[in-house]
Interface confidence: medium
């Protein structure tokens, strides 16, 4: 038994990365800890060193192979253990039977670009990164646009319920600076969550009339 409350959460990016966060109230300080991944039916195992991200939480990334290699499938179950050094021994602090395709969090979309911009609308495209071919078209997206004088949290969410890697933003204000972000989520997986938001794409709508100063 471990003193304090422990939480061990991991997500699979659908290709070759499992990211984990371990939180432990009253956890031992200055102790070396790692996450060990042991698949149920594969010839490899992997470890990563847990590094502190706050007073009582640590994180690490299990790199399973080349970024676009399909290292796990829907059938795999990976036993994940948090091991902390106790003298000359390793002590198991947390354990979970990890089903990768039930715990998905994809990489943030990349390569955002303005395809076409007008006074009141802007067409933007993006690409998904390191997403498994298993999903086929079973992905959804959320997008948000940052308007002047507002925060990201205030921005309304636009939902795309299909694999659509573009959006046409309407009813924009002419000659105005905006920022745009998008995130992706597979439809599969009981504990699947949204990817991080993409890097913001800044764009400016065209002026309303020719000759107007920008």
């Amino acid at each position: 038994a471990v003193n304090g409350t422990s939480q061990f959460t991991c997500f699979y990016n659908s290709r070759a990365n499992i990211s984990c966060v371990w939180s432990q109230d009253g956890a031992l300080q200055d102790t070396s800890c790692q996450v060990h991944a042991w698949p149920d039916r594969r010839r490899w195992n992997q470890t990563c060193e847990l590094l502190p991200v706050s007073q009582a939480s640590w994180a690490c990334n299990l790199i399973l192979g080349a970024p676009d290699s399909q290292k796990l499938t829907t059938v795999d179950i990976v036993t994940l253990r948090v091991l902390c050094r106790e003298g000359v021994r390793w002590r198991v602090m947390a354990i979970q039977d990890f089903k990768p395709f039930e715990n998905l969090r994809l990489m943030a979309p990349i390569s955002l670009q303005v395809v076409h911009v007008e006074t009141h609308r802007c067409n933007i495209s993006w690409e998904i990164s390191q997403a498994s071919h298993y999903f086929e078209r079973h992905l959804e997206f959320e997008a948000r646009t940052l308007s002047p004088g507002h925060t990201w949290e205030e921005a309304p969410l636009l939902t795309l319920k299909q694999k659509q890697e573009w959006i046409c933003l309407e009813t924009l204000t002419p000659d105005t600076q905006y920022e745009f972000q998008v995130r992706v989520k597979p439809l599969q997986g009981e504990f699947t969550t949204w990817s991080p938001w993409s890097q913001p794409l800044a764009f400016r709508t065209k002026p309303a009339a020719l000759g107007k100063d920008t």
Epitope: R41, R43, W44, I77, T79, D97
Partner: antibody
Framework: EVQLLESGGGLVQPGGSLRLSCAAS????????VHWIRQAPGKGLEWLGA???????QYNAAVKGRFTISRDNSKNTLYLQMNSLRAEDTAVYYC?????????????WGQGTLVTVSS | DIQMTQSPSSLSASVGDRVTITCQAS?????LYWYQQRPGKAPRLLIY???NLASGVPSRFSGSGSGTSYTFTISSLQPEDIATYYC?????????FGQGTKVEIK
């Protein structure tokens, strides 16, 4: 040496219950997933479910709700609890473990235990 | 569930013959296994991941295939090979087996 030994089979009436045991030796049940597979007389093999090293379970929908897989870590033993038994549950029941890091598939099998459901 | 269909369901061959069994999956599978089951015994793993020979298995046994179509071959049938052979997929749950192919000696 990895060994699996099933026990607990026998004759049971329809609607009855039975608990099968699978005693493991040569490895720890907290380090490997163990599966239950059955074979009706003169028929093929049917996967029933598994208990993984962390203790979570997975079932074939055909038996989910009636069959429960559990384990006792201190005894290094797995169990298959079977409720609401039917004539079609008559079979030899095997526990099996996948291989180690050198190869996959069900490399280790018990000898099986016969369950007969009949009035 | 993925259905695994083996053919033939039974065959009779002479010692030294080349024996081939096919396994057809109802949808594409990534990992295929072959087992041998002698009468009254538990199954024995012969082939893992489609084509790899399990530990201690004679080299006369082999496997091949991909997608939905797989083949198991005994290059030179021996008397001790009398058994029923099963294919099994481990690409999605529930894990499923073929119905078996009974191999006899003429």
């Amino acid at each position: 040496e990895v060994q699996l030994l099933e026990s607990g089979g026998g004759l049971v009436q329809p609607g009855g219950s039975l608990r099968l045991s699978c005693a493991a030796s040569g490895f720890s049940v907290t380090s490997y997933g163990v599966h239950w597979i059955r074979q009706a007389p003169g028929k093929g093999l049917e996967w029933l479910g598994a208990i993984w090293s962390g203790g979570s379970t997975q079932y074939n929908a055909a038996v989910k709700g009636r069959f429960t897989i559990s384990r006792d870590n201190s005894k290094n033993t797995l169990y298959l609890q079977m409720n609401s038994l039917r004539a079609e549950d008559t079979a030899v029941y095997y526990c099996a473990r996948a291989g180690d890091a050198n190869y996959d598939g069900f490399a280790y099998w018990g000898q099986g235990t016969l369950v007969t459901v009949s009035s | 569930d993925i259905q695994m269909t083996q053919s033939p369901s039974s065959l009779s061959a002479s010692v030294g013959d080349r024996v081939t069994i096919t396994c057809q999956a109802s949808q594409s599978v990534s990992f295929l296994y072959w087992y041998q089951q002698r009468p009254g015994k538990a199954p024995r793993l012969l082939i893992y991941d489609t084509s790899n020979l399990a530990s201690g298995v004679p080299s006369r046994f082999s496997g091949s295939g991909s997608g939905t179509s797989y083949t198991f071959t005994i290059s030179s049938l021996q008397p001790e090979d009398i058994a029923t052979y099963y294919c099994q997929q481990w690409s999605t749950y529930p894990l499923t087996f073929g119905q078996g192919t009974k191999v006899e000696i003429k």
